[in-house]
Structure formats: structure tokens, C-alpha cells
Amino acid sequence: QRFAQAQQQLPLESLGWDVAELQLNHTGPQQDPRLYWQGGPALGRSFLHGPELDKGQLRIHRDGIYMVHIQVTLAICSSTTASRHHPTTLAVGICSPASRSISLLRLSFHQGCTIASQRLTPLARGDTLCTNLTGTLLPSRNTDETFFGVQWVRP
Amino acid sequence: QRFAQAQQQLPLESLGWDVAELQLNHTGPQQDPRLYWQGGPALGRSFLHGPELDKGQLRIHRDGIYMVHIQVTLAICSSTTASRHHPTTLAVGICSPASRSISLLRLSFHQGCTIASQRLTPLARGDTLCTNLTGTLLPSRNTDETFFGVQWVRP
Amino acid sequence: QRFAQAQQQLPLESLGWDVAELQLNHTGPQQDPRLYWQGGPALGRSFLHGPELDKGQLRIHRDGIYMVHIQVTLAICSSTTASRHHPTTLAVGICSPASRSISLLRLSFHQGCTIASQRLTPLARGDTLCTNLTGTLLPSRNTDETFFGVQWVRP
């Protein structure tokens, strides 16, 4: 019974259960391909438990291996949009600190209006994740169509 | 050593490890866009540990944040079929209780025959998840092509 | 405090936190549709904590329910390429021991150049997972475009 009690008494953060699910706030101005995210119960079903938002980008607070997942749906899309503006690409990566900058996950919209994927990756406290959408396409802000999240899996 | 022993002695359900992976049973009658699911070791590799099925829909038994994932493949499909009948749309949502009804995840088959995605979302005991497939194309019942599951992640 | 200490003192493997994320090494010779994987910190962001590689295929070391995920991007590809060479199909399955051989997850590239999906499935110690890519198109070896991983979820 002791474990169950300990589990309840310790703050969840100390168990390493960092998790976040974000919804799209807005796209960047010209020359800024980043998507800007928001999260919190007041906004609906998005949340941050551990990680934080820094100017719309997700910052990691705990070292570990994370499952990173994303879905982006285009609000302005055509059967030829994806191929005409090709390659319209979504990339998720560590954008700061600069010394750790790397692309983690990349997908193109090939005659499709939605991309979705996920992967496991090591992240460190202070890593900021950016999601770059290249091309002149506008993502949907519907919370069931466009979302981005991370889940701490293990140290 | 105490933790390892405690972990083995306590029933897994008390650790909050609710998880389910379902396979397609059948589609609904006309005017009912829902997919009806089934699960259990007798059926193959599907299972329910915690959540339950209620008339083919998945009912949650434990409050928490869940990873919800789905893949649906259309049975009689080619790129041209998909675009002609397009957009066949799949939506996963809470359908009961009515007071909590909301769409959690939505995808269209855009000149493609498979959609797959996943997301983190808070769910409460008693929430029933429905998967609605709108359009005239039939989903495959192959267990490696069409499946739906949830995994409890944290309180 | 006792639980937190116990958690740190016990080897992670004893907590059942088996996890792996692999990057593509190479494709097989003719008549061998398997993708050959590699992993380890020296290679970048791939890793194996628990599972092992056996001639480029992933072997499971702990019984349990796993989340299996994969993304494969075709290297020389356009919407028309994908449909012209259609059906290029990716299947993830247990390939040994032969008695447990089964397809777990299957996807086709329909006018698209990337597939990504995930599913929960029971796996047993000794199961070897193979990823078969049928068709004449080559997968990208970029680590942000093609990857394959598993995460132990519960016993």
C-alpha cells in the first residue's frame, strides 16, 4: 500500500511525468516559418505539465527520452496546392540552444492537406522545440486538426 | 527492492496503466457514421486492460491524460477512388456523456487510402469515445490496417 | 522520499522502461524486402535501452505491451512517382520466431511520399520485428524522415 500512497503524495512532476499538448495560436510574420503554440485548460483541452511555452515555442524542463507528436491540417489547401507549392514541409526540431540545433522530424504535404507523425527522441532541460512550416500555406487552428505535444517516457 | 516488490504485488490497474487496442468489428447502419470496435485476446492482438466496450464504443474507466491513436484504411480504394468520394473524413471524439461531447481528432482521406494519427487528451471515467467515418467508402477490417487504441499516460 | 530514492537506485531496466529508436542503415539485397536498422548515440539521436539489434532487425527483451511507431519517407519521390510505382507498401511485423510471425501494421504510399503510424501490440521476449518495404522505391536515410521505434508500455 506504501507505493500507492507515495505515488499520491509526491508531486507528479517528481515522478518525471512531464507532458504537454498544445494548440495553434498563430503563424509567424514573413520570413518566420515557425508556428506559434498556446496551451492551458482555459483554452480547451491543451495543457502543459512540466514543459513551458517561451514566445509560443515549447521549452523542455526535464532531461529524458520523449515521445514527440504532431498533426497539422491546412486550412487553405487544394488537391494541387501541396504539389504546386511543393515542397510544403513541416519540420520539428530543437532550435535552441543553438549548439543543440537539429531537425527531429520532417514531413511534406504531398497532395494532402494533413500530416501527422510521432517519434521518440532524447531531449534535455532547456531544449526549445520549434515547428517550421515552409511554403505559403495556412494551417487550421481547429483544435482537433492541428496540435503538437510531448510526453516524457524515461530518463 | 521494496518498490520493485510493490510494483509486482499491486494490481496493474492500481498503477493507472489502463490501455486498450481495438480492431474493427463493423460499420454502423445508414445514418450512423460510427465505427464499431471489438477487442480481446481471442480475436488476435487486440485487448482491453481497464477501458471497456459499450456497444462497440470505447468507455474510459480511469481519469487521466491519455494518448489516443488510430489508423483506418479504406478497403476498396485507389488514389482516384479516394479523391472521387473524397473527402471521407474520420473524427474521434467524446460522444457521451453529452455534456462532454467534443471532437478530439479529425482527418480527411485526401487522395489517400489510409489515415493515421495520435494525440494526448484528458479523459474522465465514463467518457465514451466514438470514431465517426463520413463518406461512402468502407474501412478494411484487416487488423494490421485498421485499429484504434488508448494508453493512460498520467493523472 | 523513499519512492523517489528507490526509483533512482533501481536500474531503469528493472522498471520495464525498455525503449528503442532506430535510424535506417540500408535496404536489403534483391528479393529481401526488409529494411535494416541501426541505433546508438554515436549515430546521432537513435538508441536502444533494452531491445537489441540482430542483423539490423529489432529484437525484444521484455514481455509486455509496446507502442510501435514508424515513419518512412521515400527518397526519390513525387506524387506521380508514388502513384506510378503503386502499390509501395510498408509492413511491420514479427518475423521470428516463425511460430509468432504476424503482420502488425501495414500502410501504402498512395500519391504520397511519407507514411507514418503507430500502434499498441503485445510483444514477447525474443520476438524480432521486421519492416518490409515492397516496391521499387528507395527510402530516405535522413534521420528526421525515416525512423522506427518501440516503447514498453505495461506488462
Epitope: 514573413q30 487553405i76 489547401c77 487550421s140 | 463518406g135 | -
Partner: antibody, heavy 120, light 108 residues
Framework: EVQLLESGGGLVQPGGSLRLSCAAS????????MSWVRQAPGKCLEWVSA????????FYAESVQGRFTISRDNSKNTLYLQVNSLRAEDTAVYYC?????????????WGQGTLVTVSS | EIVLTQSPGTLSLSPGERATLSCRAS???????LAWYQQKPGQAPRLLIY???SRATGIPDRFSGSGSGTDFTLTISRLEPEDFAVYYC?????????FGCGTKVEIK
């Protein structure tokens, strides 16, 4: 109260140019994608162009691609449409319209329109 | 591009009657992303329905939308005097975003 007020229309010769403006008030302008939609006398509505809330992405109907340019100044809460190389078939009432918050181009608020007449 | 065909061109009805307006697409509309607007002479269009069946803010419940794929319907359950106008459907699933040419609902 959301308000959209177009201006800048008028009579112009074929090949000529105009700059249409749309002054917005009553909402956070930079949070919304905007479009121009036109309606020729007695004809159907036709979507012309769209721009994201930040101004970073622009979209055009094929009939105006290369001739029209959409832009916005979020500091002035104003949407613009620069129309060049005008043709007789561009004669229409031009409406500015706000996209739904989702960014999808269905239009929850419209201006009253400004008439552009292309004639020699 | 997706062509939207509205029928009938004109609908002559009396107040209190039920109006059924049809909009047919030349190909399936992605996500059932179809909207309905009302336009009165000299005025801008007004959004009634989006997503084929969701009523816009402030729209009376006598207006309802239905349909999916290629066939969509706007129903006005009991016509009020202020409902006599031209009604347009619009698909916004794929660019270019196209409108039907309207159904005029006039007093019989």
C-alpha cells in the same frame, strides 16, 4: 462590434490600377486571416484573394494571379488589395471579409463593399 | 475547381412555409467544409451555416444545414418575412473557394 469598411473603388480604364482598402475595428485584427471576395453586377460571388493574420502567407484565385496583390498593415488594422492591369471582367463590388478564427475561409463578417468599374 | 450548382434558381413561398434549398458539388467537398450565406439587396452576405450543419452565432434555429460529400441542403423550417433573400452556398475545403450562383427565395 466588428466592423469592416472598404474604400478606394471607382471608375478606371482597362489596364489601369486601383488600391482598395478595408479598415477593420472591433476585433484583434492581427489574429484573423482576411479575404477579398467580389460580385459582378447580377452575378455570383467569387473569392479573389486571402492573407494570413501575420501577413506571412498570401493566396490568389487564378483569374487575378500576377495582377492583384493582397497585403495588410496590422499596426493600422487595415487590409489592402492592389489591383493592376484591370479588365472589363474585373468590374464588381469588392468585399473584404474576415475568416473564421480557425483560419478556414468561410466568412463570419463582411464589409459593405466598394464598387470597381472598369470601362473606357 | 469545384463547381457548386444551386437549385432551384427561384423558390416562391409564403411566410410560414418550409423552404428547402439544394447545393450540389461537382466533386466531394473536403471535410464537409460547406457554408451558407444570406444576401439581401444592397447588403453584404451574412453567414448562416458553416461545416455543412453548424449554425453561426446569432442565427435562429429555424435555419438548419445538412448533407455531406456532394449533396447539401439548407432548410428554413418556417419562413419569416425577413427570410426572403438570395441564399448562396460556398465550399471552403479546397482552393479556389467557390460559391454557388444562389437561390432566390421570394414571396409567393
Amino acid at each position: 462590434e466588428v466592423q469592416l469598411l472598404e474604400s478606394g473603388g471607382g471608375l478606371v480604364q482597362p489596364g489601369g490600377s486601383l488600391r482598395l482598402s478595408c479598415a477593420a475595428s472591433g476585433f484583434t485584427f492581427s489574429s484573423y486571416a482576411m479575404s477579398w471576395v467580389r460580385q459582378a453586377p447580377g452575378k455570383c460571388l467569387e473569392w479573389v484573394s486571402a492573407i494570413s493574420g501575420s501577413g506571412g502567407s498570401t493566396f490568389y484565385a487564378e483569374s487575378v494571379q500576377g495582377r492583384f496583390t493582397i497585403s495588410r498593415d496590422n499596426s493600422k488594422n487595415t487590409l489592402y488589395l492592389q489591383v493592376n492591369s484591370l479588365r472589363a471582367e474585373d468590374t464588381a463590388v469588392y468585399y473584404c471579409a474576415r475568416h473564421d478564427y480557425s483560419n478556414y475561409p468561410y466568412f463570419d463578417y463582411w464589409g459593405q463593399g466598394t464598387l470597381v468599374t472598369v470601362s473606357s | 475547381e469545384i463547381v457548386l450548382t444551386q437549385s432551384p434558381g427561384t423558390l416562391s413561398l409564403s411566410p410560414g412555409e418550409r423552404a428547402t434549398l439544394s447545393c450540389r458539388a461537382s466533386q466531394s467537398v473536403r471535410g464537409n467544409y460547406l457554408a451558407w450565406y444570406q444576401q439581401k439587396p444592397g447588403q453584404a452576405p451574412r453567414l448562416l451555416i458553416y461545416g455543412a450543419s453548424s449554425r453561426a452565432t446569432g442565427i435562429p434555429d429555424r435555419f438548419s444545414g445538412s448533407g455531406s460529400g456532394t449533396d447539401f441542403t439548407l432548410t428554413i423550417s418556417r419562413l419569416e418575412p425577413e427570410d426572403f433573400a438570395v441564399y448562396y452556398c460556398q465550399q471552403y475545403g479546397y482552393s479556389p473557394f467557390t460559391f454557388g450562383c444562389g437561390t432566390k427565395v421570394e414571396i409567393k
